[in-house]
């Protein structure tokens, strides 16, 4: 049975205290005192007898520029808004010293996500509210207390759609090289049902989880030279727009019927994925239309079956694989899920098993290339306009966002004469409004101490005379006398 308690717990984990490596001493695009998330960041994790160093880069391709959010307002009306301009905290990258490694994490409130090293998939999540430097659990998916989930797409339906499956067609590519074709893009619309909303408790929590999931799905597809870009999110915070049944095939039919009615007034997209908090019957956690990508039936339903978002991300990647014409690996004679991984570990395995998969098999890749030869797949060729930031700049929310020079809160609260609270621009004649090196609206002269030494290894920082913020905290390297 798919887990009826969706937030299962870990059976076995290691406690780690991530250590953020100091970045280069260069001016950042936004003031450091605002605590906004940097373009690149590295963390050292002491886990499983190793020190893993994760090098991460913000996923700037996570959202399309026309990204919309739809929800129900307090008065019961449906509202669609197009947030613009805020920063975000979803990263992708690799593990230093491991050539085929991958990492996909959010850093919004501690570190959460996965990193893959060789055949091991490590999951990480915060254990407390100590932020990125606090206690985190690092564990392997098999140590989540959950049972295996299966895909509801039947082998019979796959057979009739995909024809005979033999290994002859699947000539493995040398090494891990990407397909030589152009990058393809799936413009994704995600619908979150009321059960999932109730489980997570707020629109902000839903948005955070969906962005985390899509970030993971995108990372899984990058090895196929595919990008998954979120163009719309619909949250059923008040009530479901159609019946979400425990029978996944009924729910998929309802989703596709509803989508057909909505397409004219909803964001144009290549694929729709429902994330539900409903427990599907039996062991099924996902169901999809096979080879339906770019058609009106392009969609799938996914149960959020695991505490860790990597779980539903793997399910979504699998169901999207069916939309892209992929069969279950075990249906294909001679299908190779790279030999360094044991059988059943690839994304298109019929059962997700107790350990989350992290790659596509050779036959999945061949099915995909075959699907891309069809005229139907043309919708994947257009690169969407990519939004470079999530959410919109909100003047008055105490965060300096794109296009703002300062933000001291709503006009009735602002007591900072250096900042025009209605425009979030500097007041006339002001050089700065925030920061340790800003005094009386002017940047302090170079050489003024702005951060004293904390201990023997720390270095004191001084204002540089040009910027209102104190330079990033620096310290002597270990071993320096």
């Amino acid at each position: 049975i798919a887990p009826s308690r969706p937030w299962a717990l870990m059976e076995q984990y290691e406690v780690v205290l991530p250590w953020r490596l100091p970045g280069p001493r260069v001016r950042r695009a936004l003031p450091s005192h605002l605590g906004l998330h940097p373009e690149r960041v590295s963390y050292v994790l002491g886990a499983t007898g190793h020190n893993f160093t994760l090098h991460l880069r913000k996923n700037r391709d996570l959202l399309g520029s026309g990204y919309t959010e739809t929800y129900t307002a307090a008065n019961g009306s449906e509202v669609t808004e197009q947030p613009r301009g805020q920063d975000h905290c979803f990263y992708q990258g690799h593990v230093e010293g491991y050539p085929d490694s991958a990492a996909s994490l959010s850093t919004c409130a501690g570190l959460r996500g996965f990193f893959q090293v060789g055949s091991d998939l490590h999951l990480i999540e915060p254990l407390d509210e100590g932020g990125e430097g606090g206690r985190h659990a690092v564990y392997q998916a098999e140590h989540l207390l959950q049972t295996a989930g299966t895909c509801g797409v039947s082998d019979d339906s796959l057979g009739s759609l995909l024809g005979p499956r033999t290994a002859a067609v699947f000539r493995p590519r040398p090494g891990d090289s990407l397909p030589s074709r152009e990058t393809r893009y799936v413009e994704l619309y995600v619908v979150v049902d009321n059960a999932e909303f109730q489980m997570l408790g707020s629109e902000a929590a839903v948005r955070h989880r969906v962005l985390e999931v899509v970030n993971h799905v995108d990372k899984l597809y990058q090895k196929l030279n595919f990008r998954v870009v979120l163009v719309g999110l619909e949250i059923w915070n008040s009530q479901d727009r159609f019946h979400v049944s425990p029978d996944p095939s009924v729910t998929l039919e309802n989703l596709l019927t509803w989508q057909a009615r909505q397409r004219t007034r909803r964001h144009l997209h290549d694929n729709v994925q429902l994330i539900t908090g409903v427990d599907f019957t039996g062991t099924t956690v996902g169901f999809a239309r096979v080879s339906a990508m770019c058609s009106h039936s392009s969609g799938a339903v996914n149960q959020d079956h695991s505490k860790n978002p990597v779980g539903v991300a793997c399910t979504m990647a699998h169901e999207m694989g069916h939309n892209l014409g992929m069969d279950h690996d075990e249906n294909v004679q001679g299908c190779r899920c790279q030999e360094r991984f044991e059988a059943g570990r690839c994304i298109m395995a019929g059962s997700i098993g107790s350990s989350f998969p992290r790659m596509f098999s050779d036959c999945s890749q061949a099915y995909l290339e075959s699907f891309l030869e069809r005229p139907q797949s043309v919708c994947l060729a257009n690169a969407p306009d990519l939004s470079h930031l999530v959410g919109g700049p909100v003047c008055g929310n105490l965060f300096v966002e794109r296009g703002e020079q300062c933000d001291c809160g709503p006009p009735e609260d602002c007591r900072n004469r250096c900042c025009n609270s209605t425009t979030c621009q500097l007041a006339e004649g002001a050089q700065c409004a925030h920061g340790t090196c800003c005094q009386e609206c002017k940047v302090k002269p170079a050489g003024e101490l702005c951060r004293p030494k904390k201990d023997m290894c720390d270095l004191e920082e001084f204002c540089d005379g040009r910027h209102p913020e104190c330079p990033e905290d620096a310290f002597q390297e270990n071993g320096t006398p």
Epitope: G35, L36, H37, A73, A74, V79, E81, Q86, D87, H88, C89, C108, A109, G131, E203, A204, R207, H208, V390, G391, V394, G396, N397, L398, F399, G409, P410, E412, D413
Partner: nanobody, 121 residues
Framework: EVQLVESGGGLVQAGGSLRLSCAAS????????MAWHRQAPGKQRELVAA???????NYPDSVKGRFTISRDNFKNTVYLQMNSLTPEDTAVYYC???????????????WGQGTQVTVSS
Amino acid sequence: EVQLVESGGGLVQAGGSLRLSCAASGNIFRIETMAWHRQAPGKQRELVAAIRSDDMTNYPDSVKGRFTISRDNFKNTVYLQMNSLTPEDTAVYYCNLIQRRAPYSRLETYWGQGTQVTVSS
């Protein structure tokens, strides 16, 4: 109207820790930001920590690395974990909620009554 009730203040020795809580109730719509500010005697009120609807956080340099803001979406509650406290952290700490009733409508701001934090040397 929105009500904000702070708790957790008190007297603590230098180097100690405190955890402040602020529970919001009433007509809550779309919260943009929840924040903590403080005001020491004879000084201007200053921002201590803020958390945005997407969990982005903002701290001034004076508390970065010592204070952590977090929230519980289910309970509309915001917390401030304060570690390595110094006498300079002595002040009245105020909870602040910034929300809007509909997308792009004007921001509304609400304040709690404040809770006293005293750090003795």
